[in-house]
Amino acid sequence: AVDLTLLANLRLTDPQRFFLTCVSGEAGAGRGSDAWGPPLLLEKDDRIVRTPPGPPLRLARNGSHQVTLRGFSKPSDLVGVFSCVGGAGARRTRVIYVHNSPGAHLLPDKVTHTVNKGDTAVLSARVHKEKQTDVIWKSNGSYFYTLDWHEAQDGRFLLQLPNVQPPSSGIYSATYLEASPLGSAFFRLIVRGCGAGRWGPGCTKECPGCLHGGVCHDHDGECVCPPGFTGTRCEQACREGRFGQSCQEQCPGISGCRGLTFCLPDPYGCSCGSGWRGSQCQEACAPGHFGADCRLQCQCQNGGTCDRFSGCVCPSGWHGVHCEKSDRIPQILNMASELEFNLETMPRINCAAAGNPFPVRGSIELRKPDGTVLLSTKAIVEPEKTTAEFEVPRLVLADSGFWECRVSTSGGQDSRRFKVNVKVPPVPLAAPRLLTKQSRQLVVSPLVSFSGDGPISTVRLHYRPQDSTMDWSTIVVDPSENVTLMNLRPKTGYSVRVQLSRPGEGGEGAWGPPTLMTTDCPEPLLQPWLEGWHVEGTDRLRVSWSLPLVPGPLVGDGFLLRLWDGTRGQERRENVSSPQARTALLTGLTPGTHYQLDVQLYHCTLLGPASPPAHVLLPPSGPPAPRHLHAQALSDSEIQLTWKHPEALPGPISKYVVEVQVAGGAGDPLWIDVDRPEETSTIIRGLNASTRYLFRMRASIQGLGDWSNTVEESTLGNGLQAEGPVQESRAAEEGLDQ
């Protein structure tokens, strides 16, 4: 099971002092959101027990494997369900803590109930403040059962759940009708997926016989040990005030584990620490009792004394849970409760035993999960013990499980089961990822998903030029950091592969799939300079440049011209794809715009240094429109147009253009040039009699300007059909242009 503990501090006089801490003993736990260890999550779960909204709770991370939740402002903030999630991948595990209000109408006699599939579970809610009304039981927030208040037995409302199945698991509550949900008794029911003493997919495997209140996990057969106990079968007690799968964690504060509730992965649930009991875990065990919630009885024999944390402390000459075994009986010594080896390794396993008569090599044997018995290849005999060494044949996955060391002498026999985990070395499922490249180096992310088992102890990156038969170069890197491969050849493809290792002999996995990474071209180093430029129109610019003369071939594929329009915040890029080019025509520019211009050499995707910039002002486009255009019929074939010059001219007008069109006509308009720009009047001749015409005009400097307003006028009647309009200009009357 995952080594994950959720601690609740139950000193409830002041909710602001209340805290929840989630502690992980897993390697690499909580390091962050990378492939090597997702973070610990600790949160209040409001899906079932909803409480009034309050200020947000504060989450504090203490190192890599601990997270604490604080900031409770009132007792109601505490009521409900809290969860901690830890572990990576398939081992991701949620630990749940259910908090009851000490002032609730109904209180649970026992919060966590772990039962086997098919058992009858009985939830008991004790009356704390009586109400003469119905009691409603809910399961995961939905209605489940109703009791009349008369149905209380000895001040308790009982909910019997016969033949429970795993889907019956969840949060149960008992509430008086019309009472606040915060006054409910909340329970957690955990239903193991198998009957008592069994585990595995078909519940065909036998549990190891967990001691001291440990619970056999229905998926992997491991004992989830109560806080304060360790070992494959929870056979060893931790020192007072310690917890965790290896007793590696210490209870905070001077009073040890007093006032703390410990929640462990299912199917264990929650309990007080070893040596403590009561709804707030503040009461020491009564004499003769020990362990989590003081649920265990010592029953020590042969002069043993009861320690409320560890159980029987045996006098010299005796051992066993109740001091019932004489030291004359052989005894397995200091056997590790769990060993880990890598697949296909051939490890040596030692098993030490003592006793009277003294065990010899042939009296110690090792039994594998499939029943195969191994005999020791050698034994080391010391005054106080014999250590037998077993050479294990090449390990396969089926060797995972409970092994047993057994000693037999004429004085009796002893055996010790221990768990062997056969781990599969990790193999990358994907190639490493290229982050950035330069001409002589590649920056690579080695973090890839993998098959097999973690944790990852080392990452090796193997690389060599593509299609090469030379030896691979290898670099050993930190799993969590990006790697820079240096001193490479420019514009060269490299085959790159990852190899992952896990701890222990034979932990190196196979190489992952290769990927091709290509170094960049050499960077172009020459800096061009702008020789000159000239405007070829309002939107056209001819640019020329030069390069310094250097020996050898030119490193470059072409030039990049950049025009920066600072007013509009726009950049225009023009690619000149010949490295021999020294001039370029830029078209489609915006007239009247102030540009900053530079040029740089490029090679592949790399840009060389830019030339010093030049500042270019394009002339504006055509002039503004003529003003106050007016048409006046003179005869049946002539109309006079008058106007005023445009304002704010950027230069001298070269000509005017008049557009003539028959009103409502479908044909193209006729354009007539007025080549004397000083004129402010012209006569359009050759028009048809009694015909309505539309006129507009514009000026030209270097380009044509904006059109004026359109005016309408009709020729006078009864004339002959004309050949077509022509114009005659004349100077305006004095002062007309003012």
Partner: antibody, heavy 117, light 110 residues
């Protein structure tokens, strides 16, 4: 799908007896309080009796107390109403209904009881 | 047993909203509990639960039906009236005392 089906109604003389049944399906019958409600022709609804899931506690309207008995058989998913000493004013459509906390969330289609000489 | 008082009839046009009131006589029913429910009954049919716990709607009931409570009076509001809303409506309240349990219905509102 929750279903409640009443049966046992009919014509009975004043002073006579009748036993109504209500067959339940589609839910865990043994977890819910059950209720009988009646409706006299052209009149409103009148609560008659309630029984708790265990069957151990029962309550009655004053108008039927001492004459009617509510019971249940959780193994058969069936609710009963034993009606004795029937009177003309007991003439009504009798509905069984499932109690959920403090509401009646599912009702049967009803069975007509007519008390007449 | 005293009943809960409702108006004998309420009318409205399609698309309009109407409100039916339900007034209790003691703190044992509407005023004292948040356990008022509303039922709809079409002629010749069984009653159907529309609202429970004053304002909660069972799944499958249109959100045009809503409930509320103020003091000793509960209310059912039907918005966007449809022809199919024409029916009898009853309020109900679960009444609990130390010695009895009962269920009280209001006088019908057409």
């Amino acid at each position: 799908e929750v279903q409640l089906l009443e049966s046992g109604g009919g014509l009975v003389q004043p002073g006579g007896s009748l036993r109504l049944s209500c067959a339940a399906s589609g839910f865990t019958f043994s977890n819910y309080p059950m209720t009988w409600v009646r409706q006299a022709p052209g009149k409103g609804l009148e609560w008659v009796s309630r029984i708790y899931p265990s069957g151990g506690y029962t309550y009655y309207a004053d108008s039927v107390k001492g004459r009617f008995t509510i019971s249940r058989d959780n193994s058969k998913n069936t609710l009963y109403l034993q009606m004795n000493s029937l009177r003309a004013e007991d003439t009504a459509v009798y509905y069984c209904a499932r109690g959920r906390i403090a509401a009646l969330d599912y009702w049967g289609q009803g069975t007509l009881v007519t008390v007449s000489s | 047993q005293s009943e809960l008082t409702q108006p004998a009839s309420v009318s409205g046009s399609p698309g309009q909203s109407i409100t039916i009131s339900c007034t209790g006589t003691s703190s044992d029913d509407v005023g004292g509990y948040n356990y008022v429910s509303w039922y709809q009954q079409h002629p010749g049919k069984a009653p159907k639960l529309l609202i429970y716990d004053v304002s909660d709607r069972p799944s499958g009931v249109s959100n045009r039906f809503s409930g509320s409570k103020s003091g000793n009076t509960a209310s059912l509001t039907i918005s966007g009236l449809l022809a199919e809303d024409e029916a009898d409506y009853y309020c109900g309240s679960y009444r609990v005392t130390s010695v009895s349990r009962s269920y009280v219905f209001g006088t019908e509102t057409k």
